[in-house]
Interface confidence: low
């Protein structure tokens, strides 16, 4: 399955939207910074394409879930958020099309399941952090920066998959 070129462009647009969503200075929130333990090793280049597609799908699905809550709607600009949803939705569609075409469905390696679980746990830590911080503006800013970072890392994986074809 070939991810379309538009998928790559969509990833860049997503990053740009995340950058534009900034509402307050991250510098005023340095004390709120937190290491969420992004499971970087689950996005290593050692993966086969069949294993990466579902992990990337999970990553984007979790971002979508995180930013679709009512707390998120209250924190961010509605117009930017709508554009953000659209980009994520399109990327989910691209990845789902790959899964439907048979990539990653013939076998479900345990390693892949572990990777999906690691991504879910990562987002659970982010959700817990937001709850503990009572969804404060600084907490959301820290999370926005973190998602931008982790999404960027997963985008790099997509690019490396494309270049290996």
């Amino acid at each position: 399955c070939d991810l379309p070129q538009t998928h790559s462009l969509g990833s860049r647009r997503t990053l740009m939207l995340l950058a534009q969503m900034r509402r307050i200075s991250l510098f005023s929130c340095l004390k709120d910074r937190h290491d969420f333990g992004f499971p970087q090793e689950e996005f290593g280049n050692q993966f086969q394409k069949a294993e990466t597609i579902p992990v990337l799908h999970e990553m984007i699905q979790q971002i979508f879930n995180l930013f679709s809550t009512k707390d998120s709607s209250a924190a961010w600009d509605e117009t930017l958020l709508d554009k953000f949803y659209t980009e994520l939705y399109q990327q989910l569609n691209d990845l789902e099309a790959c899964v439907i075409q048979g990539v990653g469905v013939t076998e479900t390696p345990l390693m892949k399941e572990d990777s999906i679980l690691a991504v879910r746990k990562y987002f659970q830590r982010i959700t817990l952090y937001l709850k503990e911080k009572k969804y404060s503006p600084c907490a959301w800013e820290v999370v926005r920066a973190e998602i931008m970072r982790s999404f960027s890392l997963s985008t790099n994986l997509q690019e490396s998959l494309r270049s290996k074809e």
């Epitope: 991250l26 510098f27 910074r33 992004f38 970087q40 960027s152």
Partner: antibody, heavy 118, light 107 residues
């Protein structure tokens, strides 16, 4: 394409002030921070501070507090860095840099050499 | 302030060599570590951000790893255009600080 164009080289006497400009183009000016970093001849890089292009907020390294002022002109997408009470050890190339977020810089100005000499 | 210590301060290598530069932070900086390349008379150029993310347009022979206090920049196969000075930078807390630099010279 993204560009940061800085003002030309300056020669100043000790005790004087210098104001270096950094004109941004090719991106939405208000969406990104501009940071200033300097480099003395043959030395490493030293971070000076940041300017929020949107709000005008600033943050300076303690070392430069009281001597540095960063401002911006949104109408021309230009950021300024003024350093006062210059001394010989301020002789350096001053760079402005566009921050992607969280402290990394994807674009830099070409640098402005400021020489402080009596 | 967080101190960043790079090693070695300089190294000589040949085209095709695998080169490793290390950077150590005086306290944990999570993965807020960036690598820059600088050539004489030029502005620094971003190579790696967030410890291991390759900046767009940077050749894949460059890679970064590490978390916490210890980080590594690796050039898998040194090319003629890679002879330059490399700096690590922490962006965990202000003042952001750079390592002293590692000069990669031709053997």
């Amino acid at each position: 394409q993204v560009q940061l164009v800085q003002s030309g080289a300056e020669v100043k006497k000790p005790g004087a002030s210098v104001k270096v400009s950094c004109k941004a183009s090719g991106y939405t000016f208000s969406n990104y921070y501009i940071h200033w970093v300097r480099q003395a001849p043959g030395q490493g890089l030293e971070w000076m501070g940041w300017m929020d292009s949107n709000s005008g907020g600033t943050g300076y390294a303690q070392k430069f507090q009281g001597r540095v002022t960063m401002t911006r002109d949104t109408s021309t997408s230009t950021v300024y860095m003024e350093l006062s009470s210059l001394r010989s050890e301020d002789t350096a190339v001053y760079y402005c840099a566009k921050e992607v977020f969280s402290g990394w810089y994807d674009y830099w100005g070409q640098g402005t050499l400021v020489t402080v000499s009596s | 302030d967080i101190q960043m210590t790079q090693s070695p301060s300089s190294l000589s290598a040949s085209v095709g060599d695998r080169v490793t530069i290390t950077c150590r932070a005086s306290q944990s900086i999570s993965s807020y570590l960036n690598w820059y390349q600088q050539k004489p008379g030029k502005a620094p150029k971003l190579l790696i951000y967030a410890a291991s993310s390759l900046e767009s347009g940077v050749p894949s022979r460059f890679s970064g790893s590490g978390s916490g206090t210890d980080f590594t920049l690796t050039i898998s196969s040194l090319q003629p255009e890679d002879f330059a000075t490399y700096y690590c930078q922490q962006s965990y807390s202000t003042p952001y600080t750079f390592g002293q630099g590692t000069k990669v010279e031709i053997k």
